[in-house]
């Protein structure tokens, strides 16, 4: 599996993963005693055929083109989770591994 | 975990898994055996904030609302494999569980 | 109905030739993968070839490779099988097969028989 | 190449009985092993493929098992047309190889 790496200087249009700082406390998110923030990343770019396609079905659906299916889209085709210690809503402190916080590659799905 | 199911009568604008039957004879891919054809289903449809969405992530992002991340979009979010019988290229008949060709859900991602 | 009807059949001496035929009918042939099979008299079966729908991709066992070669006429709705430089080994009763995940229609069979 | 050890080679059984035929694949095929039947002077015909599917218009007293290296197929209530040699087919991968056959006989 592969996927592109960018930062806000690339000139690269095509799917791509871009670094992300989410920041709880600037949400307003005080649920979440820790972490404050994390480096969460995002996709983005332009899907053009067989680019990056994670899956064969999104190239049979290519070919069989059926009604209202639109192309690929830039998505996070890898994504791994983050420890956190934030308060249940039940007055309760909880400390978990949240899935699928963090992409780690983005690809055409 | 949640997804709609819908057929070509529906009105439905959401995202949403549709059924696509795809034949491999009709795209001349002759190195494959069997199935001739297989459900595969596609995922398409409008994905509204908050509608469907597969991952934290996918809303974390949105409250970023960093350069150039376009909302969500539809996407399969669970897949299933078919077991195919091929031709590998090297005069060999293989049999193997083809990973991710059958679209079991879709989501906003 | 399916029908696989194999012909060519016969006495050949050592190191000769032959050519197998089986004309297919009762489905669309050339939509399907064919394999021959053969069966020495009184033994088990043996997997010779395949062939894909249009003929692109072969296989074969390496008993019969070099020697023997599959193909196939979708026009004519007959599939064939070149054997070469036949050996008393490759007498059997060989068999044209419909291919799916499995062989899943048979012909009656032609026998060969390789002997000086 | 992968060898298919079948047994038993032959057994008799009377008309009602279970029979349970194996199969052992000398590495792991998956759900990839088909059932055939063969009457004296006829051409096989294939009963189960991918171990566990029975094929178009095949009694429901076949039924087949298994997958990785050992494989089942069992005749619920053998029938007077079962009498006959069964041979079991890996087609996981060529070159495809067949068992040595079972030869179902009338005790």
């Known amino acids: 599996d592969f996927g592109l790496d960018c930062d806000e200087h690339s000139t690269e249009s095509r799917c791509c993963r871009y670094p992300l700082t989410v920041d709880f406390e600037a949400f307003g998110w005080d649920w979440i005693i820790a972490p404050k923030r994390y480096k969460a990343n995002y996709c983005s770019g332009e899907c053009e055929f067989v680019f990056l396609q994670k899956y064969p079905h999104t190239h049979l659906v290519h070919q069989a083109n059926p009604r209202g299916s639109a192309g690929p889209c830039c998505t996070p085709t890898k994504m791994s989770p983050i420890n956190m210690l934030y308060f249940n809503g039940k007055e309760q402190i909880i400390y978990g591994k949240i899935p699928a916080m963090v992409v780690d590659r983005c690809g055409c799905s | 975990d949640f997804g709609l199911d819908c057929d070509e009568h529906s009105t439905e604008s959401r995202c949403c898994r549709y059924p696509l039957t795809v034949d491999f004879e009709a795209f001349g891919w002759d190195w494959i055996i069997a199935p001739k054809r297989y459900k595969a289903n596609y995922c398409s449809g409008e994905c509204e904030f908050v509608f469907l969405q597969k991952y934290p992530h996918t809303h974390l992002v949105h409250q970023a609302n960093p350069r150039g991340s376009a909302g969500p979009c539809c996407t399969p979010t669970k897949m299933s494999p078919i077991n195919m019988l091929y031709f590998n290229g090297k005069e060999q008949i293989i049999y193997g569980k083809i990973p991710a060709m059958v679209v079991d859900r879709c989501g906003c991602s | 109905e399916v029908q696989l009807l194999e012909s060519g059949g016969g006495l050949v001496q050592p190191g000769g030739s032959l050519r197998l035929s089986c004309a297919a009918s009762?489905?669309?042939?050339?939509?399907?993968?064919m394999s021959w099979v053969r069966q020495a008299p009184g033994k088990g079966l043996e997997w010779v070839s395949t062939?894909?729908?249009?003929?692109?991709?072969?296989s074969y066992p390496d008993s019969v490779k070099g020697r023997f070669t599959i193909s196939r006429d979708n026009s004519k709705n007959t599939l064939y099988l070149q054997m070469n430089s036949l050996r008393a080994e490759d007498t059997a009763v060989y068999y044209c097969?419909?291919?799916?995940?499995?062989?899943?229609?048979w012909g009656q069979g032609t026998l060969v028989t390789v002997s000086s | 190449d992968i060898q298919m050890t079948q047994s038993p080679s032959s057994l008799s059984a009377s008309v009602g009985d279970r029979v349970t035929i194996t199969c052992k694949a000398s590495?792991?095929?998956?759900?990839?092993v088909a059932w055939y039947q063969q009457k004296p002077g006829k051409a096989p015909k294939l009963l189960i493929y991918?171990?566990?599917y029975r094929y178009t218009g095949v009694p429901s007293r076949f039924s087949g098992s298994g997958s990785g290296t050992d494989f089942t197929l069992t005749i619920s209530s053998l029938q007077p047309e079962d009498f006959a040699t069964y041979y079991c087919?890996?087609?996981?991968?060529?070159?495809?190889?067949f068992g040595g056959g079972t030869k179902v006989e009338i005790k």
């Open positions: 009762g489905f669309t042939f050339s939509s399907y993968a």
């Open positions: 087919q890996q087609h996981y991968s060529t070159p495809w190889t």
């Open positions: 097969a419909k291919q799916d995940y499995a062989m899943n229609y």
């Open positions: 590495q792991d095929v998956s759900t990839a």
């Open positions: 991918s171990a566990s």
């Open positions: 062939i894909s729908s249009s003929g692109s991709y072969t």
